[in-house]
């Protein structure tokens, strides 16, 4: 009976999400393997988040709006491990917008989800950021490593969206 009611709840939750995400990929987790954590298909998952790489070239603001429509934000990178996971799926000759910007050009960087900007957990390429006119951040491959660079916000780039996993 308990299992039956849990299944019914799950199905109704799945139906609820189906209007936003036609297809979800779920894995069982938790100590009794009773919880399902899901990401929209074909998003990838790492820890408690889902990631989507958009190859559409758009400005930073349009990229953020595009993520927002999908219930996500441009990616906020919190750890080196998270960055290493994300970069496994990126092309080395491309650049991707992050959810990091400095709209006033005062070098006051801010994450789109209001996560405090911690200078000690940043992965800027050497010499970056280097221009107050370049107010948005990308991740790209340079000098044999992935890192961040400040660029002009209005110039179209690819982007990475991030959202919390859906638990059902």
């Amino acid at each position: 009976n308990f299992m039956y009611s849990k299944t019914v709840k799950r199905l109704s939750k799945l139906q609820e999400y189906q209007q936003y995400y036609p297809s979800l990929t779920c894995v069982m987790e938790g100590k009794d393997m009773e919880d399902w954590s899901c990401c929209p298909t074909p998003w990838t998952s790492f820890q408690s988040s889902c990631y989507f790489i958009s190859t559409v070239m758009q400005s930073w603001t349009k990229s953020q709006n595009n993520c927002s429509v999908m219930g996500a934000d441009l990616v906020v990178i919190n750890t080196k491990e998270e960055q290493d996971f994300i970069t496994q799926n990126l092309k080395i000759n491309s650049a991707y917008f992050l959810g990091l910007s400095d709209p006033k050009g005062w070098r006051h960087w801010q994450w789109v989800d209001q996560t405090p900007y911690n200078k000690n957990v940043t992965f800027w390429h050497s010499g970056e950021p280097n221009s107050p006119d370049e107010r948005c951040a990308i991740i790209n491959f340079r000098s044999e490593e992935w890192g961040w660079n400040d660029v002009h916000c209005h110039v179209p780039q690819k982007s990475i969206c991030k959202m919390k996993k859906i638990y059902i």
């Epitope: 758009q58 349009k62 953020q64 221009s131 006119d133 948005c136 916000c153 209005h154 110039v155 179209p156």
Partner: antibody
Framework: EVQLVESGGGLVKPGGSLRLSCAAS????????MSWVRQAPGKRLEWVAT????????YYPDSVKGRFTISRDNAKNSLYLQMNSLRAEDTAVYYC??????????????WGQGTTVTVSS | DIVLTQSPASLAVSPGQRATITCRAS??????????MHWYQQKPGQPPKLLIY???NLESGVPARFSGSGSGTDFTLTINPVEANDAANYYC?????????FGGGTKVEIK
């Protein structure tokens, strides 16, 4: 006083080349992004090329990509536009404009008087 | 590309009256309260001159008779009261994404 003075316009045959120059004064040229904007007779303004302050980025619309090259010499306070494979539709007044960044975009706060380019056989 | 449509194409206004020009963008040029629409004045044989930046900010040295408003896709430039030397073409421009684009212009004539 900010001044932008263009030169180098003229009459050229289709397929020909021309190099426009813009001499800047009255401000720290190396600190600003610069653009070329053109205006065909009786038409709207059209952005042609942008170069970032540090010379690290150049941008072009599809209509001129591969034919036009923007460059700058910060030591000489000068902006250039090399125009190759010119077409009749490139006929316009070409303005040099200074960019001022605002939030996620920018605007053109100073413009030169313009130089006329006529492409005709 | 973002297309900017200005209306009217031309208008004739008497000195002391109000002139209103609108600019409609094919998609939003606003983001989190910042509106990346700008206005320029161009007199015959002269380069454009910046009047208003970011929808409503008056450029230094521009008379307070000029004002701008709007957000999203719809923006307005108002001249009130109009003076004889306001006869010119007026253009809107967006810069939220490349390529920066301009409106087709509005010709203001003084009656």
């Amino acid at each position: 006083e900010v001044q932008l003075v263009e030169s180098g316009g003229g009459l050229v045959k289709p397929g020909g080349s021309l190099r426009l120059s813009c001499a800047a004064s009255g401000f720290t040229f190396s600190s600003y992004g610069m653009s070329w904007v053109r205006q065909a007779p009786g038409k709207r303004l059209e952005w042609v090329a942008t170069i970032s302050s540090g010379d690290s980025y150049t941008y072009y619309p599809d209509s001129v990509k591969g034919r036009f090259t923007i460059s700058r010499d910060n030591a000489k306070n000068s902006l250039y536009l090399q125009m190759n494979s010119l077409r009749a539709e490139d006929t316009a007044v070409y303005y040099c404009a200074r960019q001022l960044y605002y939030s996620y975009g920018y605007y053109f706060d100073y413009w030169g008087q313009g130089t006329t380019v006529t492409v005709s056989s | 590309d973002i297309v900017l449509t200005q209306s009217p194409a031309s208008l004739a206004v008497s000195p002391g009256q109000r002139a209103t020009i609108t600019c409609r963008a094919s998609e939003s040029v606003s983001f989190h309260g910042t509106h990346l629409m700008h206005w320029y004045q161009q007199k015959p044989g002269q380069p454009p001159k910046l009047l208003i930046y970011a929808a409503s900010n008056l450029e230094s040295g521009v008379p307070a008779r000029f004002s701008g408003s709007g957000s999203g896709t719809d923006f307005t430039l108002t001249i009130n009261p109009v003076e004889a030397n306001d006869a010119a073409n007026y253009y809107c421009q967006q810069s939220i994404e490349d390529p920066p684009t301009f409106g087709g212009g509005t010709k203001v004539e003084i009656k």
